[in-house]
Interface confidence: low
């Protein structure tokens, strides 16, 4: 089954089919009997309920809101509501680049070392059954590959492989032809030696908080492309519904390494969140490095020397 749409901020290109899938979809038995509502709000309009009559381009299924296709005026906030479950997304629909086969702002960059294994597979599991054919383009020139359902490149990388690779899926829906484009900017680089990853800032951080408020703990590291950064907390990671690990952000440094940042968001801080360790770890092939955060009630700040506090 296709995963749900967990990212709260989404950018998508106008004119393409698009869908939002809420994350309580696994509760299949509840779904059938419970009232479910999708809402949109944008600018002056506050929480307008969506239904198939809202637009001929919108289709509603149990778990999914589909756009056939998504257009610029679909930009806004979307909400799914079922019993006491709510999920929200902010959708930004951007203009298609009419002079290219892809839109620059919707490109995924990937760095591959020369002579290392290089793979591109064109796949789209959600629309799989509707896809008639798929083409793979390099710098907007069609590549002639055997498989026109899931075109694939698998090889050891050479410098000539550098470029923009666009997977274009062609599909029919209600008698109309649509296409979905996914583009990868592949950069081929010389063999690079690894650094020992390092977490930035002090190893132990006391964070002054107020009960009922929210806090964002930011963990930053300098690391190699394949290193991982993750949060660990509590007995079972992720058992607290008020704790959310945000999407990792990465920026490449001029030396070809990565500056990574991962935020742990704790909402509606309770007593159970105080005086426990929230550990951020960076793990590489050479081992791990960890830094810890402890939430302390503002009233108790006087007990701790000022220099150990972070904001």
């Amino acid at each position: 089954a296709e995963s749900c749409t967990s990212r709260p901020h989404i950018t998508v290109v106008e004119g393409e089919p698009f869908y939002l899938k809420h994350c309580s979809c696994s509760l299949a038995h509840e779904i059938e009997t419970t009232t479910k509502s999708w809402y949109k709000s944008s600018g002056s309009q506050e929480h307008v309920e969506l239904n198939p009559r809202s637009s001929s381009r919108i289709a509603l299924h149990d778990c999914v809101l589909e756009f056939w296709p998504v257009e610029l005026n679909d930009t806004g906030s979307y909400f799914f509501q079922m019993k006491n479950y709510t999920q929200k997304w902010k959708l930004n629909v951007i203009r298609r680049n009419k002079h290219s086969c892809f839109t620059e702002r919707q490109v995924t960059s990937k760095i591959v070392e020369v002579k290392k294994f290089f793979q591109i597979t064109c796949e789209n599991s959600y629309y799989q059954t509707l896809v008639n054919s798929t083409s793979l383009y390099k710098n907007c020139k069609k590549l002639l590959l055997e498989n026109n359902k899931n075109p694939t490149i698998k090889k050891n990388a050479e410098f000539e492989d550098q470029g923009y690779y666009s997977c274009v899926h062609f599909l029919h829906h209600n008698g109309k032809l649509f296409n979905i484009t996914k583009t990868f900017n592949i950069t081929i680089v010389e063999d690079r030696s690894n650094i020992v990853p390092v977490l930035l800032g002090p190893k132990l951080n006391h964070v002054a908080v107020e009960l009922g408020k929210n806090v964002r703990l930011n963990c930053s590291a300098l690391l190699n492309e394949e290193d991982v950064i993750y949060w660990m907390f509590g007995e079972e990671n992720g058992s607290d519904p008020n704790i959310h690990e945000e999407k990792e952000m990465r920026i490449m440094t001029p030396e070809g390494k990565w500056h990574a940042s991962k935020v742990l968001r704790i909402e509606n801080i309770g007593e159970s969140n105080l005086n426990v360790l929230y550990n951020c770890t960076v793990a590489s092939t050479g081992g791990t490095d960890t830094k810890s955060f402890i939430l302390v009630r503002k009233a108790d700040m006087a007990d701790i020397p000022g220099h150990v506090f972070t904001r």
Partner: nanobody, 115 residues
Framework: EVQLVESGGGLVQAGGSLRLSCVAS????????IRWYRQAPGKQREWIAS???????NYADSVKGRFTISRGDARNIGYLQMNSLKPEDTAVYYC?????????WGQGTQVTVSS
Amino acid sequence: EVQLVESGGGLVQAGGSLRLSCVASGSTFSVNAIRWYRQAPGKQREWIASITDSSSTNYADSVKGRFTISRGDARNIGYLQMNSLKPEDTAVYYCNVMKNWDNYWGQGTQVTVSS
């Protein structure tokens, strides 16, 4: 999205062997390295082995010479062959992959080594 499922854990006597599998399903474009970690009760999750997209391998000192990491021909499956197991190898074993710099973890498989 990538989903990971580990299997092959269980109860084994010291000196015995187990082979763990990690299968990545879903969208597996640019799942480059497969890594294994383990977490013993009350301890930090620790890295134990990696295999990169070009099949070069790396091991933590604690398992070097006893554990072997490999990947299947389909490239979306990783293995951890564990020989000469010791009681201190008891832990939940997790596999991890990265796709476009998002980390994906499996649910883990329990390995218990009795003396």
